[in-house]
Every structure is written in C-alpha cells, then in structure tokens.
C-alpha cells in the first residue's frame, strides 16, 4: 500500500514539474482604461488530456445503451471555451456590470483579468493594480481591523470611510472590543452577511486601479445590499474603475456599461438605455412571455420548456436545423460584432435541467402532513454550488432533432413507469404536432413536450396504453447523426462524483 501511495505522489510531482512555467503578466502602470479584445479562454490542458484518455479507453470496449461508459462515447468537449470572443472597454472611473445566469462565465471573466485563467486568443489591457472580492467571503484568524487592513498601511480616514460604506459600524459597535474583536479560531463567529461585508471592506480598503467585485451581495438582504451598493460601489468608489458581477436589474441601471454573458459568449454589451431599446426582444428573451401570469403552474412549466427550446416547434413547416435564428442581441457600439453561434442557434446551445422527485427534501418549508400526490416536475432551483448536492441532475440534454440516447432512455423509463413504479401518470393523448401555441391548455406537462418532440419525427401517437416494444423502436439510435454536446459543468460534476 505504501508503495502505491509513493508511486501516486511521485506521479503527481512529476506531472507538476512537467507543466509549463507560470508566466507573470506584464502590466503597464500608465494604462488608465480596461480593455478586452476578442478574448477566448479554455480550461487548462489537463482536461483535454483526460478526455483523450477517456475516449481511447471507451473505444476499446463496446458500449450498450444503458452502460455508464456511454458518458464518454459521444462528446465534443475537447475544444469547449469557457469564454468566447469577449469584447469590452471601460474608461477610468467607470462601472461595468457583468450579468448572466449561473455558469455563463462571469467569474471566469474576472479570472482572465487577474491572470488566473490564460486566454488562448485576444488581448487584455489594464494597469495590473487589482483588488478582488470573491463571491465566497473568507475570514482570517485575527481582529476585524486586521481582516480589513490585511497588511496594507493603515489610514484612519480611509478605514473609517470603508467601515461606514460597508455598513459595519453598527456591527462593530455591538462588541465591547469594537473592531479589535478576534474572529476565527478562538474568536467569535460571524453571520454570512457580516463575513460578506468584511470581505468587501477588505477589497475596497486596498488601493487599486481596478476593483473586481464578484457577486459581493449574495448573502446580504435586499435593504443592506441596496445601501451598500449606493454608499460603497457608487459613492465611495466613484472615481475607481469597477467591474461588478451582479444579476440585479437595479445595479445594471446604475452601471456605465453592461456586459451580459450567456454560455461563455457575449449576449449583450452596451449601456442600459441600449439594452432597453432592444424591445421587444428585451422582454421576450430576458423576461419570457408577457401573458405568462394568466397560465396555470403546469402551463408555465410548459412555456418555460418551450422558451428554452426555441426551435422548430414555432412553425408548422419543417425547419432546417442549421438555420440561423433572428439576431436580436448584437453587441452594440465599439465592438459591434455578430453574436456567437451558441446564441444565434439555440439548437447548439445546451440547457441543463434537473428533473427531481418532489419530496420534502427539496421543499424547505412544506408541512409534513401535505397530502399532495407525488409528481415529477421541472426543478427551477438555480444551479448553485451550495445547493447542488441535493439536486440529482440529468447529465446532458441535447436540443437537436434526434434526442440523445440518455435522454431517450430516461423518457422511456418515465413513460413505462420503470423509474417509479408507484407513480400513476395520467396523460392525455398527444397527437403529432409541430406547433406549441401559447394559448392556455389544460394539464400540459413536460411529458407532453417530450411526447411532441418524439412524435415530431415518428408520427407515433402516444396514448395511455403504451406498447413498450413499439416505444423502444422509436428510441432507436443512429449514433452518427446525434450531435455530441455537453457542458463543462456536467463534465466537472461527473469527475467530482466519480473521482477515485
């Protein structure tokens, strides 16, 4: 055992020594603006090697439909950039708000600016004097004062201004030792909100040319968040260049420039007024459908599914799968380039869903005596790091004309009750159709959406009496015609779960 452990350690050291030397970035301290031109960045080379090995191993053995090894049999992840052709320019003293859904590449963008993630293409220009506030607040053992000053020379006026702007005065006044109260080991425990404010204060206290604030308000209540955004980000730091990762519409309104990321690409770049001028595209893409609130909960889920899969369901005539969609969110201004394919062509975009069993586990706050029938439904829980552990996920969902093998198998299992025997799914007959209207329809569920997608190709009418063999024939796989796509998050989740 010791021998194997030693070998493992030696291999790790060897791998480390063989890596490329870390290149310290060259900065120009006279630079006043922050510029990113056509920046594309990939995950480090180790991931690519791992995929090559996995694919080789997989080619050496035959895979069946349900085999776990199928995971590596059909994908195109080797060249998946975490950021694709990103452009922006902000002048000294401006605020750039970076928005986007989970996994869009917001933090990766900051990592590229800091030099933690090396771009494969493009240019980045800034002075190099950076202060960073992580979305995960951290505290070092020591006093509150030490945690904020953090080795920087002490300036009483600056320190007091930061304490006030970050709403820490009231918290500090509660302690007899004031800001000399010890935190961490042997000291007091702070709330998530207090830790977040101290982390922000630390970043703001440091003198820098560029402040990178990665979702600093995540653990703050809406009133505190609003006050700190105004007093700290907008007033105290008014003459500083700031890049704020945020999802709040209120913050976007106050920003000089807005960059919205989606799956690593630039979905929109410009000012808030330019964003508003994109009506009605603005409301349809960012806000969904206006008449949404008159629909039942189940209908909403159906519309959600439809919104996320805007392809040939929207017309009766068959649509070419390579057809380019309407260009609505073009980058405006200086970098007015065409949007990336993943945005233009939703077919190639990957959507991650959670199909979770509705149990008290996922429903914080539901009374135990709730007698609602069990049902499968689309989980709308955001894909957050903290919440991921309790949310079992379907690895891949492909929006191509032919569903991926895994997706088909899960739908097959769902329809034939093989996943949950005790579940009684009453379904209405769904005829083959291409058009999903937005008019309210009774009891339309995700199953109906799946059924439509299946029947779209086969013309098969699925009724309550399902012949399993007939159904299996509809799920026949022509592996070569299946577009092989997944996401980095899926891959990383897989590696995390299956690492030895």
């Amino acid at each position: 055992q010791t021998w194997y452990d030693s070998l493992g350690a030696i291999n790790k050291i060897q791998d480390f020594l063989q890596k490329q030397e870390y290149k310290t970035l060259e900065y120009n301290l006279t630079t006043t603006e922050v510029v990113m031109e056509n920046v594309t960045a990939f995950w480090e080379e180790g991931f690519g090697e791992l995929f090559e090995k996995a694919k080789q191993n997989n080619n050496n053995r035959k895979t069946s439909n349900g085999d776990d090894s199928l995971f590596f049999s059909n994908f195109s992840l080797l060249g998946t950039p975490v950021l694709k052709d990103i452009n922006f320019k902000i002048e000294r003293g401006q605020l750039l708000a970076v928005a986007g859904s989970t996994g869009a590449g917001k933090t990766s963008l900051l990592m590229v600016i800091m030099g933690e993630l090396e771009p494969s293409e493009g240019k980045i220009k800034h002075s190099g004097r950076i202060s960073f506030c992580s979305q995960f607040s951290w505290i070092m053992p020591g006093t509150i004062k030490e945690n904020i000053i953090f080795g920087v020379s002490y300036d009483e006026y600056r320190y007091r201004s930061v304490i006030k702007a970050c709403q820490l005065e009231e918290d500090i006044s509660k302690f007899a030792e004031k800001d000399n109260i010890v935190l961490g080991e042997g000291g007091i425990t702070l709330s998530g909100g207090q830790r977040a404010r101290i982390s922000l204060a630390r970043a703001v206290y440091k003198d820098a040319d560029l402040y990178l604030l990665d979702s600093p308000f995540g653990y703050l209540d809406v009133l505190t968040e609003k006050e700190i955004f105004e007093s700290c980000v907008c007033k105290l730091m008014a003459n500083k260049t700031r890049i704020l990762v945020t999802s709040k519409m209120e913050h976007l309104k106050k920003a000089d420039k807005i960059l919205i990321l989606h799956e690593g690409s630039s979905y929109f770049y410009g000012t808030f007024s330019e964003l508003q001028n994109l009506q009605p595209d603005f409301s349809s893409k960012l806000m969904g459908c206006d008449s949404f609130d008159q629909f039942s909960a189940e209908r909403r889920n159906s519309i959600l599914t439809e919104t996320l899969h805007r392809f040939s369901l929207e017309g009766d005539a068959p649509v070419s799968w390579t057809e380019t969609k309407k260009q609505s969110f073009k980058q405006t201004g200086e970098f007015g380039e065409k949007r990336k394919n993943s945005i233009l062509n939703p077919i190639n975009s990957i959507r991650k869903f959670s199909i979770v069993q509705k149990t008290p586990l996922q429903m914080n706050g539901i009374e135990e005596d709730s007698d609602e029938p069990l049902e499968r439904r689309l989980s709308l829980v955001p894909d957050s790091e903290q919440g991921e552990a309790i949310l079992p996920r379907i690895s891949v969902i492909s929006t191509g004309p032919t569903l991926q093998a895994r997706r088909r198998q899960s739908v097959l299992n769902l329809m034939t009750h093989s996943v949950n025997q005790g579940q009684n799914i009453h379904r209405k007959t769904t005829a083959s159709t291409r058009k999903v209207s937005l008019a309210p329809q009774a009891n339309l569920t995700e199953l109906d959406i799946y059924s439509r997608r299946l029947s779209q190709e086969t013309g098969l009418e699925i009724s309550e009496e399902i012949n399993e063999e007939d159904l299996k024939e509809c799920f026949f796989d022509d592996m070569e015609s299946i577009p092989a796509v997944t996401t980095w998050n899926t891959y990383l989740r897989y590696i995390t779960v299956h690492k030895s």
């Epitope: 928005a99 869009a104 919205i260 949404f292 609130d293």
Partner: nanobody, 121 residues
Framework: VAYLQESGGGLVQAGGSLRLACVAS????????MGWYRQAPGKQRELVAF???????NYADSVKGRFTISRDNAKNTVFLRMISLKPEDTAVYYC???????????????WGQGTQVTVSS
Amino acid sequence: VAYLQESGGGLVQAGGSLRLACVASGNIFTINNMGWYRQAPGKQRELVAFITSAGITNYADSVKGRFTISRDNAKNTVFLRMISLKPEDTAVYYCHQAVVHGPIGLEYDYWGQGTQVTVSS
C-alpha cells in the same frame, strides 16, 4: 412581471404564534433570495429574515430563535413561522422575492403589499 401575495397576518396575544406565507405568481423563471421585512409605525423598514436559493438563512438579532424562514421552490412560496411573539413584533410584514424572468438570469426585486401583525399584551 411578478406579483406577491402575503397571507397569515392577524391579531395574536403575546407568546402566541403565527405563520406567514407569501406566494409569487406571474412570469417566473426562478427565484433567488426570498425574505421577510417589517415596518413598525414611525420606523424604517427592517430585515426580519431572508433565505438564499441555496437555503442559507439569515435572521435579525431580535428574532433569532423565535422565527423560522423556509421556502417551497416548486410553489414559489416563502414562509415565516413566528413563535413566542412579543408586542414589539407588531408591524406590517412585507415579503420580498428576487425574481428571474428568463434564462439570461437578470434579477428583479418584487415586494408584497404587506400583512399586518399585531401582538397584544
């Protein structure tokens, strides 16, 4: 657009309990932070409790140990269980939800109309 509707407020004696609920309806893709805030006459609105999308909770010092916040993501609802109520808990209780309307992830703040909670001594 989303709409928030609070319920569960009312008159209760000191030491009693209440359970507030707030349901969001309308165009909802997902909801991030949810919270309860209160405003007593002549005072500013203040935090009671809030819960993140990951289920992490935060409470005002004055209600710790007495109030419990929880959420039902499937029903877009946030609850506030209040026990050992005190006369100083008397206020209008407002619900807040940070609603995301579409897949791009932009977040909009919505507030309920408020529900009166009166604790008599």
